[in-house]
Interface confidence: low
């Protein structure tokens, strides 16, 4: 393995070996080795042992290697909304008089117009709009399932608000279900959460588009506010390229530090797409803070400086106890833009573009 | 700003302006700029603004600078674990035949024991063991709040099992509460959650250590599986060196390669405490993978190199179009171990320690 | 139990002031403490509090960056630093200990209070 | 601004029964936080007089009682005495801001 120069692996063990020498004694705060002498000799308490079993369990649990994200998460997305079902559509007839929830429907065949292959879809959300509303409430959604079953999704516990709000819920695994399966109608259940003694379960929370007093308002202003799905996708001919093979790749962490420090921190960079790229084809935004990484990282030698001061520096400069610590971004977020190809414009979203933070690892 | 050679700002701009150039084209999957000629004058369709607001207030609301984490976080966590109340006690009285529901009371003195100060909390879940089950039940946890009252905390959905297991929930927030109010009984309700229109809503799991059966059986054995708190904690002596000022730290992501991959990827390194740093101290375990990252990233010319085949490298080796990418630590998982201090054995978990996949950044 | 602030008196904006709060008849270095203002004719304004190894210290939004509360635990004192003092910052200010180790939920003894004035 | 909501002003007759309210939100009072009372007689310090939303402090006579629901927190006096006139306020930790905040305060005037 080379970079630019040779790589002597050994090392680069032995740096990262006693990094780790520092890093361990650094987050315990010892100075050096705690003394041996006054150690019971046997094996350890049972008491012990359980307590550092639960712990090892939880880390095992909680860690257990995430899915990895496929190749295709690095490119752009394209955005649609679909609207639900009309509320003058018979299909709601039944669902009138249910005092403890509101019904939403959807056609399929409008989903699959927008993604036409399940795998395309990389995130689906539900947004209702709710009026304002003076009332706390905890609200549960659920998905159709079969004929006369529904399918817990999610809650919310929604305090009283004095303007609209709009309410977001993660549904990418039902609509990709949605998708495999053949077209129809599916739908959302948004409930009252009922308790198991209380005898008022009703539905306090009104959402645009739904609720009974509002039902006749269905003009475009209406429209925009009703119930939607907002979906991201890639499309179909950019799909092509994509490989099965999944591969892994970054997404989001924690971060950085004032913009008077030498060492590694964020720095401002604002890209303007015309004079920076001379691009006159992004119509929205016109620009946007990229940002980038700089500063130096030193790598610390704890060999011979097992003390206080240096092993306090660990946590600021090499906190994952690198071999060679290096400034990078540490948490991105992604740009929205709106383009055209030929005349129909396209709002796709770039992952990954701004550089909120940066971090020595 | 310097590292080890003068860095010329202008050209790091100007190498992060045309990565970005790159990024953007690589994730349209475009080989130039689309041609602007046949674009309709005028502004944008109201839809079209319409998706390209929904799209952004969804960045914006996903986004929002996340709680920067204290930098208590670097340092190792005491891990503790405190026991529900035991059910002979008058307290479980009045809650005996209630069908929906079970109750686990904690004595807040106890907790206040392990983790004398709230800000010294890091994570506390509440660990409680299920014992095998054929039915599946859709469950809810709820915290005591006031006389009559209780606060949602958050459901699962348990699926028949075979074997006893472990259901954990993270309860940080409400042993802070704990820990900021007066010392007394607090408790928890572990309910079947009740259906809007079942009228069966009877608790079907059983817990260990509470279901009614097992009640005579409190030995040893069994207090190792009752319910209890998993408490993780800055110890107050380690916590005095600790500046109240925050800065934030990395966490998690996602990832790797092959091991054959010649660029940046995980490189396996086992460290064994004994052998490699020279400590009998540390009791438990023996020792880890560490492993650490290693391999080129090259930076990628896009300004006159715009065609697929290099587009097509930034995914790998640039993601995040940066002006000199580097191999550094993508996920990271801690790291429990055992010592002792005199007499006393302390199990403490190491955050960030164990390095699970590299990324160019 | 008593609680007795010293350090008021009259300073110039942009000045700095540090208020002293000599504690006794409990176990200060197990308690949460706090310090809480009112300007005259003024409702009362919490302004900070500190756990009781000053491990912690939480500050109102209006003071933040200009008060250091700090302990010293074997001279049973708590202490307001107060720097770039405004006109706005006059007020009776009380020490008070803490109905908890945090010093957030509320407190149950209050000092006398002393009054800082700032005027040019 | 006050982040709890007070009445400015009550009054009431030796004997009656007066209610102070103050008003919240889901980060103060509604997010189970426990509130306190205070009483500060004209001139003097503050004294605490409930804590724990509804524990009354030492020495406090059972006339004052508190009480909660929701958001919205009540002290409660009863046989009101001339000796209750004096200015109340509510405090509650808030998890929003991270620190303590005080109603604005209810001047009872005892007529």
């Known amino acids: 393995l080379s970079t630019c120069k040779t790589i002597d692996m050994e090392l680069v063990k032995r740096k990262r070996i006693e990094a780790i020498r520092g890093q361990i004694l650094s987050k315990l705060r010892l100075a050096s080795p705690p003394s041996q002498g006054e150690v019971p000799p046997g094996p350890l308490p049972e008491a012990v042992l359980a307590l550092y079993n639960s712990t090892r369990d939880r880390v095992a649990g909680e860690s257990a290697d995430p899915e990895p994200e496929p190749e295709a998460d690095y490119y752009a997305k394209e955005v649609t909304r679909v609207l639900m079902v009309d509320r003058n559509n018979a299909i709601y007839e039944k669902t009138k008089d249910i005092s403890h929830s509101i019904y939403m429907f959807f056609n399929t065949s409008d989903i699959r117009e927008a993604v036409p292959e399940p795998p395309l879809l990389s995130r689906a959300e539900l947004r209702l709009q709710r009026l304002k509303s003076s009332v706390e409430q905890h609200v549960e959604l659920y998905q159709k399932y079969s004929n006369n079953s529904w399918r817990y999704l999610g809650n919310r516990l929604l305090t009283p608000t004095d303007t609209p709000e709009w309410l977001s819920f993660d549904v990418t695994g039902v609509v990709r279900q949605w998708l495999n399966a053949g077209d129809g109608i599916q739908g959302f259940r948004f409930s009252a959460h009922c308790s198991c003694d209380s005898k008022d379960n009703k539905l306090h929370v009104e959402i645009n588009g739904i609720s009974p007093k509002r039902r006749g308002d269905l003009g475009t202003i209406h429209d925009m506010n009703r119930p939607f799905l907002l979906l991201m996708a890639t499309p179909l001919e950019r799909a092509q390229h994509l490989h099965s093979s999944r591969h892994r790749r970054a997404l989001d962490t924690n971060y950085c530090f004032s913009s008077t420090e030498k060492n590694c921190c964020v720095r401002q960079l604002y890209i303007d797409f015309r004079k920076d790229l001379g691009w006159k084809w992004i119509h929205e935004p016109k620009g946007y803070h990229a940002n980038f990484c700089l500063g130096p990282c030193p790598y610390i030698w704890s060999l011979d400086t097992q003390y206080s001061k240096v092993l306090a520096l660990y946590n600021q400069h090499n906190p994952g106890a690198s071999a060679s610590p290096c400034c990078v971004p540490q948490a991105l977020e992604p740009l929205p833009i709106v383009y055209y190809v030929g005349r129909k414009p396209k709002v796709e979203q770039l992952s990954n573009m701004i550089v909120r933070s940066c971090k020595c690892s | 700003l310097s590292t080890c050679k003068t860095i010329d700002m202008e050209l790091v701009k100007r190498k992060r302006i045309e990565a970005i150039r790159g990024q953007i084209l690589s994730k349209l999957r475009l080989a130039s700029p689309p041609s602007q000629g046949e674009v309709p004058p005028g502004p944008l369709p109201e839809a079209v603004l319409a998706l390209y607001n929904s799209t952004r207030d969804r960045v914006a609301g996903e986004s929002a600078d996340p709680e920067p984490e204290p930098e208590a976080d670097y340092y190792a966590k005491e891990v503790t674990r405190v026991l529900m109340v035991d059910r002979n006690n008058a307290i479980y009285e009045k809650t005996k035949d209630i069908s929906h529901s079970i109750y686990m009371f904690f004595n807040t003195s106890d907790i206040r024991e392990a983790v004398p100060e709230p800000p010294l909390l890091s994570r506390a879940e509440l660990r409680l063991q299920r014992l095998k089950s054929s039915v599946e039940q859709h469950v809810e946890l709820y915290q005591k709040y006031s006389n009559n009252s209780w606060r949602y905390l958050g459901n699962r959905l348990l699926t028949p099992t075979d074997t006893p297991e472990w259901l954990s929930f993270d309860v940080t927030g409400v042993v802070r509460q704990w820990l900021n109010a007066g010392d007394g009984i607090q408790g928890f309700r572990f309910s079947a959650h009740c259906s809007c229109d079942s009228k069966d809503n009877k608790l079907h799991v059983e817990i260990n250590g509470i279901s009614p059966k097992r009640r005579g059986d409190l030995g040893t054995i069994h207090d190792m599986n009752r319910p209890f708190l998993l408490l993780m904690a800055t110890p107050l002596e380690r916590a005095q060196h600790l500046h109240s000022s925050r800065h934030r730290r990395a966490l998690d992501t996602n990832y790797c390669f092959s091991s054959t991959e010649k660029n940046c990827c995980v490189r396996q390194l086992y460290i064994d405490f004994r052998k490699d740093l020279g400590w009998k101290w540390i009791h438990e375990p023996k020792g880890y993978h560490a492993n650490f990252c290693l391999g080129p990233c090259p930076y990628i010319w896009s300004l006159d190199t715009q065609y697929s085949k290099v587009l097509a490298l930034y995914n790998q080796h640039n993601p995040g179009a940066s002006a000199s990418p580097c191999c550094v630590p993508q996920a990271l998982e801690p790291l429990p171990i055992v010592y002792y201090v005199g007499r006393k054995p302390k199990v403490e978990q190491l955050s960030n320690m164990i390095v699970r996949s590299c990324k160019c950044s | 139990l008593q609680l007795v602030e010293s350090g008021g008196g009259l300073v110039q904006p942009g000045g700095s002031l540090r208020l002293s709060c000599a504690a006794s008849g409990f176990t200060f270095s197990r308690s949460g403490m706090a310090w809480v203002r009112q300007a005259p004719g003024k409702g009362l304004e919490w302004v900070s509090a500190i756990t009781p190894g000053g491990t912690a210290t939480y500050y109102a939004n209006s003071v933040k960056g200009r008060v250091t509360m700090s302990r010293d635990n074997a001279k049973n004192t708590l202490y307001l630093q107060m720097n770039s003092l405004k006109s706005e910052d006059t007020a009776v200010y009380y020490c008070?200990?803490?109905?908890?180790?945090?010093?957030?939920?509320?407190?149950?003894?209050w000092g006398k209070g002393t009054l800082v004035t700032v005027s040019s | 601004q006050s982040v709890l909501t007070q009445l400015s002003s009550m009054s009431g007759s030796p004997g009656q029964t007066v209610t102070i309210t103050c008003t919240g939100s889901?980060?103060?009072?509604?997010?189970?936080?426990?509130l306190s009372w205070y009483q500060q007689l004209p001139g003097t310090a503050p004294k605490l007089l409930i804590y724990n939303t509804n524990n009354r402090a030492s020495g406090v006579p059972n006339r004052f009682s508190g009480s909660k629901t929701g958001s919205l927190a009540s002290l409660t006096i009863t046989g009101l005495q001339a000796e209750d006139e004096a200015d109340y306020y509510c405090g509650c930790y808030d998890d929003s801001l991270n620190t303590y905040v005080f109603g604005g305060g209810t001047k009872l005037t005892v007529l």
């Open positions: 889901s980060s103060n009072i509604g997010g189970g936080y426990y």
């Open positions: 008070a200990k803490g109905l908890v180790s945090s010093g957030l939920n509320g407190m149950d003894y």
